[in-house]
């Protein structure tokens, strides 16, 4: 007699590793025999897909070589005419042992930092993943972290956080491991001990004292009123990651000695300075504070460059500031003798507004900035080819002088007239080529410290002092 | 974009204290002077108090010697701390952003000074 | 300190017409070639926005239609808006940055006819 098709085994859950067989059985009484078809996530299984064999008259689904991408539900269907078609459906679980999709890599970073080792990882179940640092398990904590997708996160690296780092990747299926890889930590230059300042007596020999450390160990230079060094004796030791340099002179006249610390980050340099005056008594005048005063400028130098009467700020740090502000100033004009003319009254406009910069008289004598805009202008439009050559003699100890060190602004660290104005002041004497800048990129406002700006008309950007905030 | 958020204002008795803070982003803020100025209700605005990137303070002569002006470059945050406060004091305080011109204004921190 | 005295107090403008703002200052804000006077707007429930700085510099973003004029050693600053409109509605400052503490004028409420 007909009967209408009965599964009589009902599809079960199939757990299935990667590239094993798994097999779906699809077991039916009926009469006459009847037609049966299988499908995946409501798909039809093709009877040709060579991916799987289908046999006992379609009661057998078998997956050759299961793929991560095959889970989902399977149903058999059968169908004789007699009576309705019935299903049975039953899910395939692509069990999976873990795997390091994206392993971490060997990270330098600088102190301070965040670093993110990354290690991204696949399996089923989801494997747990942790990390080892050097033989042991590494403990989370509020600056460590293993973020949801496996990889590390360190805020706030510290020298303590370098070492060798793996991952490991776990379920129950089993283990997978990273690579070993290192994390190093870099830091920036900075000066443990300054040299102190001395008022002498004519001819008293002063040993200058100056301690700095980093990773790697920075190289300590001296320099004498923007110039290296070129009497007395240096000697230094390396301890500890820490840089020991002493300079010994015999006084004959007041200078201003400063200790550079550098050490080098990839193709960046760290640099940190500290500067000591040696005054001789008699040579020694009063100062109106502890750290300036402001007057108008009487130097030669920079006659054409500052504003007619311009009021400057005199650095009391010095032991005859006009002096010694006049000698920087003249020092750096020498070695811009041999730069492009489009160069040099740029260049020589950043120096003097650098080092006398404008000054608000008062109690407190607040001297006013450069604005990053003008200082990038001279930088990267009127003296890019000469800035990098600077910058790389620097770098390979070939520049005669350092005085460049100390006189030439560090751009980035300068106020933007884009955030405040009237913050910083403007070079009136750059007598750019209007031409020259259709090629400078404008500012946006998002990235003020590395675009530069078209800069104002001439005529708006007149020489100006602020007075305000000089009264306590 | 500069953005200056002010927070820790609040009702207050007379002779209390209050710290306000003014979160700042968007720009390089230990380069940068930063002003408290305020403004009582339905009155003009009356400067308060800069500090400069030396961390050296003016303050107007209403609120010297009770409100102090201070900041935390790394945390990009400049702070007032209000003590002995006055009725007079109810006012919506900004935190600017500015040398000589007030160039960036947050929002604003209500401080009521009530009994 | 510097005292700054606005007028008129309050003003009602149509839109197109011009309006001019004054501030007067107790004492001379000039300082190498500059005046330290600044103007602001309040709009209604906002907080106070830089129009003009050194007297006469229009501060980024600020439509052309606002202008300041004040120089040389005059106590006398001006605020003009040539072609006054409805977003214009607010209370102008002008306040002066010649040495602290820094003051404001009383301010001038400009409304729509």
């Known amino acids: 007699l007909p009967k209408a098709p009965v599964i009589t085994t009902p599809l079960e859950t199939v757990d299935a590793l990667v590239e094993e067989v798994a097999t779906f059985m699809c077991a039916v009484e009926s009469y006459p025999q009847p037609e049966i078809s299988w499908t995946r996530n409501k798909i039809l299984i093709k009877l040709f897909d060579t991916r799987y064999s289908i046999r006992e008259n379609g009661q057998l689904l078998t997956i050759l070589s299961v793929e991560d991408s095959d889970d989902g539900i399977y149903c058999c269907t059968a169908n004789n005419g007699v009576g309705g078609a019935v299903e049975s459906c039953g899910a395939l679980q692509v069990k999976m042992k873990p795997k390091i999709t994206r392993p971490p890599i060997n990270v330098k970073i600088i102190e301070g930092l965040k670093a993110v080792l990354p290690c991204t990882t696949m399996g089923n179940p989801k494997p747990s993943v942790s990390w080892i640092k050097g033989d042991s398990p590494l403990r989370e904590n509020s600056r460590i972290a293993v973020l949801e997708s496996g990889s590390l996160r360190i805020h706030n690296v510290q020298k303590e956080d370098a070492g060798q780092y793996r991952c490991v990747a776990k379920n129950s299926l089993g283990t997978a491991y990273s690579k070993v890889v290192k994390l190093e930590v870099e830091v920036f230059a900075r000066i443990l001990r300054a040299p102190e300042s001395h008022n002498v007596t004519f001819g008293s020999f002063v040993t200058l004292h100056c301690t700095a450390t980093g990773i790697p160990v920075p190289t300590i230079t001296w320099i004498e009123n923007g110039n290296a060094v070129s009497s007395g004796s240096i000697q230094e030791s390396v301890k500890d990651r820490v840089i020991d340099s002493r300079l010994q002179l015999f006084i004959t006249k007041p200078g201003l000695y400063t200790c550079i610390a550098t050490n080098k980050h990839g193709e960046k340099f760290s640099t940190a300075k500290a500067a000591a005056t040696i005054s001789i008594a008699e040579w020694s005048k009063p100062q109106k504070d502890n750290k300036g005063y402001c007057a108008q400028y009487r130097g030669e130098v920079c006659n054409a460059v500052l504003a007619k009467d311009a009021l400057v700020f005199l650095n009391t740090s010095y032991a005859d500031p006009e002096e010694a502000q006049e000698l920087l100033v003249h020092t750096a004009w020498n070695e811009l003798k041999v730069v492009s003319p489009v160069c040099r009254p740029a260049a020589e406009a950043l120096l003097c507004n650098h080092i006398f910069q404008e000054c608000s008289p008062g109690v407190v004598p607040t001297p006013i900035p450069i604005c990053r805009e003008y200082c990038l202008a001279v930088k990267e439009l009127f003296c890019a080819k000469e800035w990098l050559v600077m910058e790389e003699k620097t770098h390979r100890g070939l520049y005669r002088s350092e005085m460049h060190l100390l006189s030439v602004p560090e751009c980035s660290k300068l106020p933007s007239m884009h955030w405040d104005p009237t913050a910083c002041a403007r070079l009136p004497h750059l007598d750019y080529n209007k031409e020259n800048l259709k090629t400078f990129p404008p500012m946006t406002s998002s990235k003020p410290s590395v675009d530069i700006p078209n800069l104002p008309s001439s005529s708006s950007s007149s020489f100006s002092v602020s007075p305000t905030y000089s009264m306590t | 974009e500069v953005q200056l958020v002010e927070s820790g204002g609040g009702l207050v008795q007379p002779g209390g204290s209050l710290s306000l803070s003014c979160v700042a982003s968007?720009?390089?803020?230990?380069?940068?002077?930063m002003n408290w100025v305020r403004q009582a209700p339905g009155k003009g605005l009356e400067w308060l108090s800069v500090?400069?990137?030396?961390?050296?303070?003016y303050y107007a002569d209403s609120v010297k010697g009770r409100f102090t002006i201070s900041r935390d470059n790394v945390k990009n945050t400049l702070y007032l701390q209000l003590n002995n406060l006055k009725p007079e004091d109810t006012a919506l305080y900004y935190c600017?952003?500015?040398?000589?011109?007030?160039?960036?204004w947050g929002q604003g921190t209500q401080v009521t000074v009530s009994s | 300190e510097i005292v700054l005295t606005q007028s008129p107090s309050s003003v009602t403008a149509s839109i197109g017409e011009k309006v001019t703002i004054n501030c007067e200052s107790s004492?001379?804000?000039?300082?190498?070639?500059?005046?330290?006077l600044n103007w602001y707007q309040q709009r209604p429930g906002q907080s106070p926005r830089l129009l003009i700085y050194?007297?006469?510099?229009?501060q980024s973003g600020v439509p052309d239609r606002f202008s300041g004029s004040g120089s040389g050693s005059t106590t006398d600053f001006t605020l003009t808006i040539s072609s006054f409109q409805p977003e214009d509605v607010a209370v102008y400052y002008c306040?002066?940055?010649?040495?602290?503490?820094?003051?404001f004028g009383p301010g001038t409420k400009v409304e729509l006819k």
């Open positions: 600017v952003l500015g040398r000589t011109a007030l160039v960036r």
């Open positions: 968007g720009f390089t803020f230990s380069l940068y002077y």
């Open positions: 500090i400069d990137t030396h961390s050296i303070a």
């Open positions: 004492q001379s804000v000039l300082y190498n070639q500059k005046n330290y």
């Open positions: 050194w007297a006469s510099t229009r």
């Open positions: 306040q002066q940055a010649y040495n602290a503490p820094l003051t």
